[in-house]
């Protein structure tokens, strides 16, 4: 928890951050909560980013005041106006930049004082990967999918029933660059599995870790996949 | 001095809709927002919805969402809510208050009862 | 939503004695909380909200605490205006919500 101390006889009110991850080309939200406030009229929002000269978004007497933002943004910003009064001071982000990563700070005024609070904004690519049976291969494979991925992430293998057992020597990974020459695709191939076992393909980088489940049996084929974003801690 | 001025007691038949008013000071609706609470006879406080006029916003309890409207005229600082299909359970003493997120100044209640 | 529960529904306390109401949130609500009382046939009066802070012309005898999901009203020295409805009201999420009341009675 980070305490913005007030000056000139105002008191200092609470702000909390979560450092947080952008997908890059999607919409990222920077989250910032605040003590609610009664006098509506009175709350400012300042979201500033370390080294940018203008402001990244300020939310003044109800409106956005978007006169002193800076060029990267323009167009890009946008808080929740309903939520400004539970005290939610977060920032809508669109079409995340690889340049958008770096300290933002959210500063609050209320009627009843001043506060700040830093957040550590990471950029990358992240996607879920899919795996599936490749019928194509000569002995029984499979084969795991996801079509964005930056920074370069690893890619770990893993069995229910040979666990610990490292996959490496029997697998296969590549990294094919998309269109946009940012993001990747990711494809990682498994060869000589076997029936009756769930394996898990795994990716991850310093920004997401997503995981890939594949349960072949003889009579179905069950899949699972999740991701989860990296270093979310609040300040 | 803030006051909320709301409109008289009113009789309703089931079916049928309703509308209160709350006047407000000029200063409390450029910088608070209006909500509406109702008390039913003997029973709690039940928040409704309300409107932030410096924010353009509007906010509903989602058991009221699709019966209720709640309006705000800037230029006579008057506030409305309007609930409609009415039942006999909507017989409540109905209140606008100053605010959320709290409310630090209330109306001084509008009873509307639903009888057939 | 969140749901707010107080307790006891009644308490009989005698005048001078000291009174702590209890309000329970169903999730974490921080310190977004509003304690009002009520006397029959008026509208609710605002005594606490951020949990512990009182309202103006609030006397210093009446305190809020708690955070989180735990929340005390307590009113030290009771007087005779004192008994009434006691009730809690979470501002941290839409929609916002009150508890059911606490009736505070002359014993």
């Known amino acids: 928890l980070i305490i913005g101390f007030g000056i000139s006889g105002r008191h200092s009110i609470t702000v909390t951050t979560v450092a947080s991850a952008g997908n890059i080309g999607e919409d990222g939200i920077l989250s910032c909560t605040f003590e609610p406030d009664i006098k509506l009229s009175d709350i400012v929002i300042q979201w500033l980013k370390e080294g940018v000269l203008g402001l990244v978004h300020e939310f003044k007497e109800g409106k956005d005041e978007l006169s002193e933002q800076d060029e990267m943004f323009r167009g890009r910003t946008a808080v929740f106006a309903d939520q400004v009064i539970v005290g939610n001071a977060s920032l809508r982000l669109k079409n995340v930049q690889l340049t958008d990563a770096g300290t933002y700070k959210c500063y609050i005024i209320t009627s009843k004082g001043k506060g700040n609070a830093n957040l550590e904004y990471k950029t990358g690519a992240f996607s879920m990967p899919e795996v599936n049976v490749d019928y194509n291969a000569s002995s029984e494979t499979l084969r795991c999918e996801a079509p964005r991925w930056f920074p370069q992430p690893t890619v770990v293998w893993a069995s229910q029933v040979d666990q610990g057992a490292n996959f490496s020597e029997v697998s296969n990974t590549s990294f094919e660059l998309n269109s946009e020459n940012v993001t990747m695709k990711v494809v990682s191939v498994l060869y000589n599995v076997t029936i009756n076992n769930t394996y898990s393909c795994m990716i991850e980088n310093d920004i997401a870790k997503a995981t890939g489940d594949i349960k072949v049996t003889e009579s179905e084929i069950k899949r699972r996949s999740h991701l989860q974003l990296l270093n979310s801690k609040a300040s | 001095q803030v006051q909320l001025v709301q409109s008289g007691a009113e009789v309703k038949k089931p079916g049928s809709s309703m509308r209160v008013s709350c006047k407000a000071s000029?200063?409390?609706?450029?910088?608070?927002?209006i909500s509406w609470v109702r008390q039913a006879p003997g029973q709690g406080l039940e928040w409704m919805g309300g409107t932030a006029p410096i924010f353009g916003t509007t906010n509903y309890a989602q058991k009221f969402q699709g019966r209720v409207t709640i309006t705000a005229d800037k230029s006579t600082s008057t506030a409305y809510m309007e609930l409609s299909s009415l039942r006999s359970e909507d017989t409540a003493v109905y209140y606008c208050?100053?605010?959320?997120?709290?409310?630090?100044?209330w109306g001084q209640g509008t009873l509307v009862t639903v009888s057939s | 939503e969140i749901v707010m529960t107080q307790s006891p529904a009644s308490l009989s306390v005698s005048p001078g004695e000291r009174a702590t109401l209890s309000c329970r949130a169903s999730?974490?609500?921080?310190?977004?909380l509003a304690w009002y009382q009520q006397k029959p046939g008026q509208a609710p009066r605002l005594l606490i909200y951020g949990a512990s802070t009182r309202a103006t012309g609030i006397p210093a005898r009446v305190s809020g605490g708690g955070s989180g999901t735990e929340f005390t009203l307590t009113i030290s020295s009771l007087q005779s205006e004192d008994f009434a409805v006691y009730c809690c009201q979470q501002y941290k999420n839409w929609p916002f919500t009150f508890g059911p009341g606490t009736k505070l009675e002359i014993k």
């Open positions: 208050a100053r605010g959320g997120p709290y409310f630090d100044y």
């Open positions: 999730q974490s609500v921080s310190s977004n």
């Open positions: 000029e200063d409390t609706f450029s910088s608070y927002a």
